[in-house]
Interface confidence: medium
Amino acid sequence: EVEKTACPSGKKAREIDESLIFYKKWELEACVDAALLATQMDRVNAIPFTYEQLDVLKHKLDELYPQGYPESVIQHLGYLFLKMSPEDIRKWNVTSLETLKALLEVNKGHEMSPQVATLIDRFVKGRGQLDKDTLDTLTAFYPGYLCSLSPEELSSVPPSSIWAVRPQDLDTCDPRQLDVLYPKARLAFQNMNGSEYFVKIQSFLGGAPTEDLKALSQQNVSMDLATFMKLRTDAVLPLTVAEVQKLLGPHVEGLKAEERHRPVRDWILRQRQDDLDTLGLGLQGGIPNGYLVLDLSMQEALS
């Protein structure tokens, strides 16, 4: 095996080109200069190296950059990125959105891998906040990205970035995440007129408080049932039948189909039955006429 460590005569690589695909692993190790590889990283992705050959190239780069690859190399990694471990990526300092896009492209069509998650984490931490361009890029590649962040991480999203969020980006968000995002969306869209505002804010309403829902009910917004079903139960409960009727408009008829599901079920239990009857939907389970309704939350606050 000792003689294999020397590069055979005439095989020393003078450029990164297609001829290298015919090199055995040990020849790549012996004949490709690490600095040459680093200078010509933009060529690697155009050459159909095997996974074993990519392992050798990665090893060379690891030796050249023990503290982590520079961005000039990272942006040209291409399929070599798939060979990187989260530990490798934690050594990187990625600041260019173009670099991020190039690497996300390599992983396109696959679920978010630990490598990609680490890369995104490094990138966002390096930027200090999740700006609009970054959010645009990340949600384009991973529509569920936003909902994969913790409420604490979401708190670094500036309101201006909310413009990049599409309804499908929020599909998997839980109420805690929407609690953080909703005030940012409200701020971002505050200068829009009623109908336009509602179109934009609709996806975020799972984080809306009661008073905002009451305000929306005065604006003829005609909220669909799907949106209503995603509202916070505690925000829906204080709404009156009249307010819910105004909020839903023609969609109010859909309450019947959802009467066994939260938040509709819990809301029905809080309403007077004769108020519910005014809707003419046959909703049952309200407070019978003649019963006294105590607001226990107010009683707790006073004691």
């Epitope: 003078r14 450029e15 080109d17 297609e18 200069d33 690490a34 600095a35 040459l36 680093a38 200078t39 010509q40 990283m41 933009d42 060529r43 992705n45 155009a46 050459i47 050249l64 950059y65 023990p66 520079p70 961005e71 000039s72 190399v73």
Partner: antibody
């Protein structure tokens, strides 16, 4: 603005070793993706690339000079150096240091220093 | 090694007139990644060379738009649409496709 400045003796005796240093200012020699090169120009002639070094110490030398060339780097001083052994009159030239950006293009050059090989 | 050959070796042009320099490489400078590694430098009298054009046709920052590059494979051209007095010097083409990187022998531009 990155600046490079060559320094070293202007006169070297035949068979001795030519030694030059390039000091980089206005930027780090450990900068991302930059390789540091030496190029020479014989009087009234064209340019000849000698070789490059990366801050990690990895080098590549022009095969025509490889047996006589050593390029080294001192990141603490932001300098890199050239040593050319067994010089002859044919090594008389203006020696330039330059930054090889992204591995392909020389974007910053020193002013050059004339080294004469003569007894 | 890749050999770079420039023509003409010298030319004299009146101010405001166009100028054209050719460069031929002994091997194609195009890589399968689509890039072509051909560069143009200008060395003004008493100065180090300065980068004009990278990857055949891209002007380096600060380079006037009267300079343009074209070509592919092994044949390349640098054009100056209207020569000015400050354009005098020696023009070099350079390849960085393959080590060792190499320069053409230079084309000296003078003003008539």
């Amino acid at each position: 603005q990155v600046q490079l400045q060559e320094s070293g003796p202007g006169l070297v005796k035949p068979s001795q070793t030519l030694s030059l240093t390039c000091t980089v200012s206005g930027g780090s020699i450990s900068g991302d993706g930059h390789f540091w090169s030496w190029i020479r120009q014989h009087p009234g002639k064209g340019l000849e690339w000698i070789g490059y070094i990366y801050y990690s110490g990895s080098t590549y030398y022009n095969p025509s000079l490889k047996s006589r060339v050593t390029i080294s780097v001192d990141t603490s001083k932001n300098q890199f150096s050239l040593k050319l052994s067994s010089v002859t009159a044919a090594d008389t030239a203006v020696y330039y240091c330059a930054r090889l950006r992204g591995g392909y293009k020389f974007d910053y050059w020193g002013q050059g220093t004339l080294v004469t090989v003569s007894s | 090694d890749i050999v770079m050959t420039q023509t003409p070796l010298s030319l004299s042009v009146a101010p405001g007139q166009p100028a054209s320099i050719s460069c031929q490489s002994s091997l194609s400078l195009q890589h399968s990644n689509g890039k072509t590694y051909l560069y143009w430098y200008l060395q003004k009298p008493g100065q180090p060379p300065q980068l004009l054009i990278y990857e055949v046709s891209n002007r380096f920052s600060g380079v006037p738009d009267r300079f343009s590059g074209s070509g592919s494979g092994t044949d390349f051209t640098l054009k100056i649409s209207r020569v000015e007095a400050e354009d005098v010097g020696i023009y070099y083409c350079m390849q960085s496709k393959q080590l060792p990187y190499s320069f053409g022998q230079g084309t000296k531009l003078e003003i008539k």
